[in-house]
């Protein structure tokens, strides 16, 4: 029979043969022959391999190193790699989340819009009319100006994006 | 460890019956294809039979077409050659060998056929 | 005779370099891999060299293979005295649908 130009899924042609490649968590070991299957072998321990392959050596496990503030978030098996995350206060430097540096706060005037997880800093949003922070923060959000006339005083100091508003007693006229 | 034993060689007439075996332990039989590979006293190695890992391939020296017959037992890990119609020529050690695509990687040692009157 | 050709016999002294070769034709080795096995005397053979030039792990770098056209060879470099054994080449032969082996070659280390 004339031998295969192309092959099946999972399948890879060498020396004129299509030889099955080896699933996730194992690695190749030996080419397929006319008489014998492809020899595959399981990653060993802190190895990984996560799609069907004819690669003669695993990968090693991600290490989430604690001195650049990373730790693990989902332990590696033998078909998918360690996924890191940072320490609390600290978020991934990118996607591939090889170093943290700490969450940024927000400036008084501004407030947090999106608190920072271990893989997103912190988004901050200037406080519109009506809202103030005093504080640098990484938590606050903008609070509103306090109210003077649910307590039945008037506005002695009108409020900014950095402070809040200064309430007074109103001014009674005598009889 | 990787082991293949072979049993059920002696001494037998010409024209006689004679069925070897081969044990294999310590890898996954069902995946390997094997080889009977034989040897004449004081001669050189001469390939006997090939059987494909699940016995739908099989192939033959000229020598021995219609003769022999090579089969395996995936469940009991064992590897046959059945020889009919032995002539004096057969007389030989006859190996069992692991097919791989590193050639005949693993070798058993041996069994001892005599054909003689 | 063998479908593959060899000396029947080579020789060298310890430390020496010895050359073993081994002829075939278009249908064997001219279209596919060599193979070399060593046997020493009173025991199995031993897969020396396969897929014409590499070496198994646990054997020396002293043994190499090589192919060109329908022809192979083995070299021995540094030869020792654990080297005499019987040596013999093989291949698979599309014309036969089966393997070929050559006639072996007897070295002896003097």
């Known amino acids: 029979p004339e031998p295969p130009t192309a092959c099946r899924e999972k399948q890879y042609l060498i020396n004129s043969q299509c030889c099955s490649l080896c699933q996730p968590g194992q690695k190749l070991v030996s080419d397929c022959t006319e008489f014998t299957e492809t020899e595959c072998l399981p990653c060993g321990e802190s190895e990984f391999l996560d799609t069907w392959n004819r690669e003669t050596h695993c990968h090693q496990h991600k290490y989430c190193d604690p001195n650049l503030g990373l730790r693990v978030q989902q332990k590696g098996t033998s078909e998918t790699d360690t996924i890191c995350t940072c320490e609390e206060g600290w978020h991934c430097t990118s996607e591939a989340c090889e170093s943290c540096v700490l969450h940024r706060s927000c400036s008084p005037g501004f407030g947090v819009k999106q608190i920072a997880t271990g893989v997103s800093d912190t988004i901050c949003e200037p406080c519109p009319v009506g809202f103030f922070s005093n504080v640098s923060s990484a938590f606050e959000k903008c609070h509103p100006w306090t109210s003077c006339e649910t307590k039945d005083l008037v506005v002695q100091q009108a409020g900014t994006n950095k402070t809040d508003v200064v309430c007074g007693p109103q001014d009674r006229l005598r009889a | 460890e990787v082991q293949l034993l072979e049993s059920g060689g002696g001494l037998v007439q010409p024209g006689g019956s004679l069925r070897l075996s081969c044990a294999a332990s310590?890898?996954?039989?069902?995946?390997?294809?094997m080889h009977w590979v034989r040897q004449a006293p004081g001669k050189g190695l001469e390939w006997v039979a090939v059987?494909?890992?699940?016995?739908?391939?099989?192939y033959y020296v000229d020598s021995v077409k219609g003769r022999f017959t090579i089969s395996r037992d995936n469940s009991k890990n064992t590897l046959y050659l059945q020889m009919n119609s032995l002539r004096a020529e057969d007389t030989a050690v006859y190996y069992c060998?692991?097919?791989?695509?590193?050639?005949?990687?693993?070798w058993g040692q041996g069994t001892l056929v005599t054909v003689s009157s | 005779q063998s479908v593959l050709t060899q000396p029947p016999s080579a020789s060298g002294t310890p430390g020496q370099r010895v050359t073993i070769s081994c002829s075939g034709s278009?249908?064997?080795?001219?279209?596919?891999?060599v193979y070399w096995y060593q046997q020493l005397p009173g025991t199995a053979p031993k897969l020396l060299i396969y897929?014409?030039?590499q070496r198994p792990s646990g054997v020396p770098d002293r043994f190499s293979g090589s192919k060109s056209g329908t022809s192979a060879s083995l070299a021995i470099s540094g030869l020792r005295s654990e080297d005499e054994a019987d040596y013999y080449c093989?291949?698979?032969?599309?014309?036969?649908?089966?393997?070929?082996f050559g006639g072996g070659t007897k070295l002896t280390v003097l």
């Open positions: 310590g890898f996954s039989f069902s995946s390997y294809g």
């Open positions: 093989a291949a698979w032969d599309d014309s036969l649908s089966g393997w070929v």
């Open positions: 278009s249908s064997n080795i001219g279209s596919n891999y």
């Open positions: 060998a692991r097919d791989s695509s590193r050639g005949f990687d693993v």
């Open positions: 897929r014409n030039n």
């Open positions: 059987i494909s890992y699940d016995g739908s391939k099989k």
